[in-house]
């Protein structure tokens, strides 16, 4: 799915009002020094692509995130604010239901959610203005940036 045409401000509002709090609840009791973020994103559509992948695609050691409250709210936000997103997810949802019945919090899942928090931070405030893409739907001014 191409996230370019999503309403980023509405998704950001949904994240800040509820999803962020659900992520914090999920991570409660975890030391803030425990995980280093290894997944990054460069602009808002890219961030949503990575967020979708980490939230809904089962990975080795963490197959159950899609059933968490934050995942369901993420799915709802994308369905509402990304045109045509729902249609692309029907098969994925059915596969998800077959994949896992119970919710299990593993260390791998905690690490994955820590990565998600980092991706959402960059979605909320992209550090760099990427040439050829717009971080903000109404943004056409130039952001000064450097790559090291």
């Amino acid at each position: 799915y191409d996230f370019t045409n999503c309403d980023f401000e509405k998704i950001k509002a949904a994240y800040l009002s509820t999803i962020s709090k659900d992520l914090i609840t999920y991570m409660s009791g975890t030391k803030s020094t425990e995980f280093n973020n290894t997944v990054s994103c460069s602009n808002r559509p890219h961030c949503l692509t990575e967020i979708q992948s980490l939230t809904f695609n089962p990975t080795a050691g963490c197959a159950s995130l899609a059933k968490e409250m934050f995942a369901m709210k993420t799915k709802a936000a994308l369905a509402i604010w990304c045109p045509g997103y729902s249609e692309t997810q029907i098969n994925a949802t059915q596969a998800m239901k077959k994949a896992r019945k119970s919710k299990v919090t593993t260390n791998k899942c905690l690490e994955q959610v820590s990565q998600l928090q980092g991706l959402w931070r960059r979605f909320n405030r992209p550090l760099l203005k990427q040439q050829g893409s717009s971080d903000y739907k109404d943004d056409d001014d130039k952001h000064h940036h450097h790559h090291h």
Epitope: A13, T33, L127, H143
Partner: antibody, heavy 119, light 107 residues
Framework: EVQLVQSGAEVKKPGSSVKVSCKAS????????IEWVRQAPGQGLEWIGV????????NYNENFKGRATLTADKSTSTAYMELSSLRSEDTAVYYC????????????WGQGTTVTVSS | DIVMTQTPLSLSVTPGQPASISCKAS??????VTWYLQKPGQSPQLLIY???NHYTGVPDRFSGSGSGTDFTLKISRVEAEDVGVYYC?????????FGQGTKLEIK
């Protein structure tokens, strides 16, 4: 406990450079942006720039472009702000701050480093 | 650059009375506004993020509202510990910019 501890006060000559350090502890340094803000005596807050310690990406306020350089050392969890070609108007308290968990605010601030530029 | 203009620049309030600070942006900043308080001799501290969300430990007598270009910070009942300079900040566009600050004193 998250802490940002900055280097001590500096007195510099006009035209010279200053390098202020900001040592972070209590969290995964690479995961959060570090912002730099300054405050001239009796004045408000002015944003200098931001660095992503994870990959070194930076974004600068145009007012400081070419004079300010932000760097980060992951091995020591320390961020640095170097300001060159100092002038008297650069006399200020310089703060480092960490972005919050949502990426929409600065939740932890250093204690500030006073830089005095005087001949 | 987006200019954030605060009014009033200073206010003196009797303990227990309300206080209100306005912040106007020179162009729309959506909901990307944060409020900080800088107490005398201290570093700034976070109060409200994304217009109306309380930071951890901030008393609920503080509230934020607004969208687009007009924003307000309200203190329902001012207490002695609330003295200091209040700053609004936008993070919708680089460079990030702050208001000039509003100094709150106790009568």
């Amino acid at each position: 406990e998250v802490q940002l501890v900055q280097s001590g006060a500096e007195v510099k000559k006009p035209g010279s450079s200053v390098k202020v350090s900001c040592k972070a502890s209590g969290y995964a340094f690479s995961n959060y942006l570090i912002e730099w803000v300054r405050q001239a005596p009796g004045q408000g807050l002015e944003w200098i720039g931001v660095i992503d310690p994870g990959n070194g990406d930076t974004n600068y306020n145009e007012n400081f472009k070419g004079r300010a350089t932000l760097t980060a050392d992951k091995s020591t969890s320390t961020a640095y702000m170097e300001l060159s070609s100092l002038r008297s108007e650069d006399t200020a308290v310089y703060y480092c701050a960490r972005e919050d968990n949502t990426g929409t605010a600065f939740d932890y601030w250093g204690q500030g480093t006073t830089v005095t530029v005087s001949s | 650059d987006i200019v954030m203009t605060q009014t009033p620049l200073s206010l003196s309030v009797t303990p227990g009375q309300p206080a209100s600070i306005s912040c106007k942006a020179s162009q729309s900043v959506s909901s990307d506004v944060t409020w900080y308080l800088q107490k005398p001799g201290q570093s700034p501290q976070l109060l409200i993020y994304y217009v109306s969300n309380h930071y951890t430990g901030v008393p609920d007598r503080f509230s934020g509202s607004g969208s687009g270009t007009d924003f307000t910070l309200k203190i329902s009942r001012v207490e002695a510990e609330d003295v200091g300079v209040y700053y609004c900040q936008q993070h919708h566009r680089f460079p990030l910019t702050f208001g000039q600050g509003t100094k709150l004193e106790i009568k």
